[in-house]
Amino acid sequence: EQAPGTAPCSRGSSWSADLDKCMDCASCRARPHSDFCLGCAAAPPAPFRLLWP
């Protein structure tokens, strides 16, 4: 859980409780064990647009 009083992480990043800061989700490809990668899976890094109405 994000520390109280901190700003939400920007798009494409997720809060790391182990490091007490936002971390880039791109690094999860190389190292998926990192604690913040769970947050990356829950929030896709790029906007998603449906291909149908």
């Epitope: 520390a3 409780a17 182990d18 490091l19 007490d20 190292r31 064990h33 990192s34 604690d35």
Partner: antibody, heavy 120, light 108 residues
């Protein structure tokens, strides 16, 4: 100059307790993750425990889980390791070490170590 | 857990020799591999981080290479102060890190 100074080691009987301290100086302590590593006499290095910069997240090796507790006091620039239910196999030199400031990829500064001997 | 295996466990070399120590991971760890030097009665000292980056203040005769599962620490020209034990350490699963068993470099 970055310095880490461990203290609190000594001789303790099996089942006993000990509290180790690691006093940090020469750098701003609060942004850095920290860890404890131990080395049994004549053996290699074994990771023991990790704590996040705020102290809100902690991790332990299976060999000490439920018996050891890592903590820190950022206002005192000090890291701690509370060791309970000590066993003969916990006999080792215990080192504290500082993690990198961007990630915990490496540990760049280490204390000189404090010896813990568990024996009856 | 990821196991780290170093070879050889010990080696004898002379001043000026080129020394190579290898470290193998039980699974791929990308480039998340560090090397430490430890002298008797002293704390470990970081030499190389992320497989090939030289830590500040470490002499350039030390170098690291490798990725995936196989890594190498090379001392291009062994100096008297280099006789020590060397450990590799994986940080792929940080903060759950593991060390190799160590390689002792002795005087021939």
């Amino acid at each position: 100059e970055v310095q880490l100074l461990e203290s609190g080691g000594g001789l303790v009987q099996p089942g006993g307790s000990l509290r180790l301290s690691c006093a940090a100086s020469g750098f701003t302590f609060s942004p850095y993750p920290m860890m404890w590593v131990r080395q049994a006499p004549g053996k290699g290095l074994e990771w023991v425990s990790y704590i996040s910069p705020s102290g809100g997240s902690t991790h332990y090796a299976d060999s000490v889980k439920g018996r050891f507790t890592i903590s820190r006091d950022n206002s005192k620039n000090t890291l701690y390791l509370q060791m309970n239910s000590l066993r003969a196999e916990d006999t080792a030199v215990y080192y504290c070490a500082r993690g990198g400031d961007t990630y915990f990829d490496y540990f760049d500064y280490w204390g000189q170590g404090t010896l813990v001997t568990v024996s009856s | 857990d990821i196991q780290m295996t170093q070879s050889p466990s010990s080696l004898s070399a002379s001043v000026g020799d080129r020394v190579t120590i290898t470290c193998r991971a039980s699974q791929s760890i990308s480039s998340y591999l560090n090397w430490y030097q430890q002298k008797p009665g002293k704390a470990p000292k970081l030499l190389i981080y992320q497989a090939s980056s030289l830590q500040s203040g470490v002499p350039s005769r030390f170098s690291g290479s490798g990725s995936g599962t196989d890594f190498t620490l090379t001392i291009s020209s062994l100096q008297p102060e280099d006789f020590a034990t060397y450990y590799c350490q994986q940080s792929y699963t940080s903060p759950f890190i593991t060390f190799g068993q160590g390689t002792k470099v002795e005087i021939k």
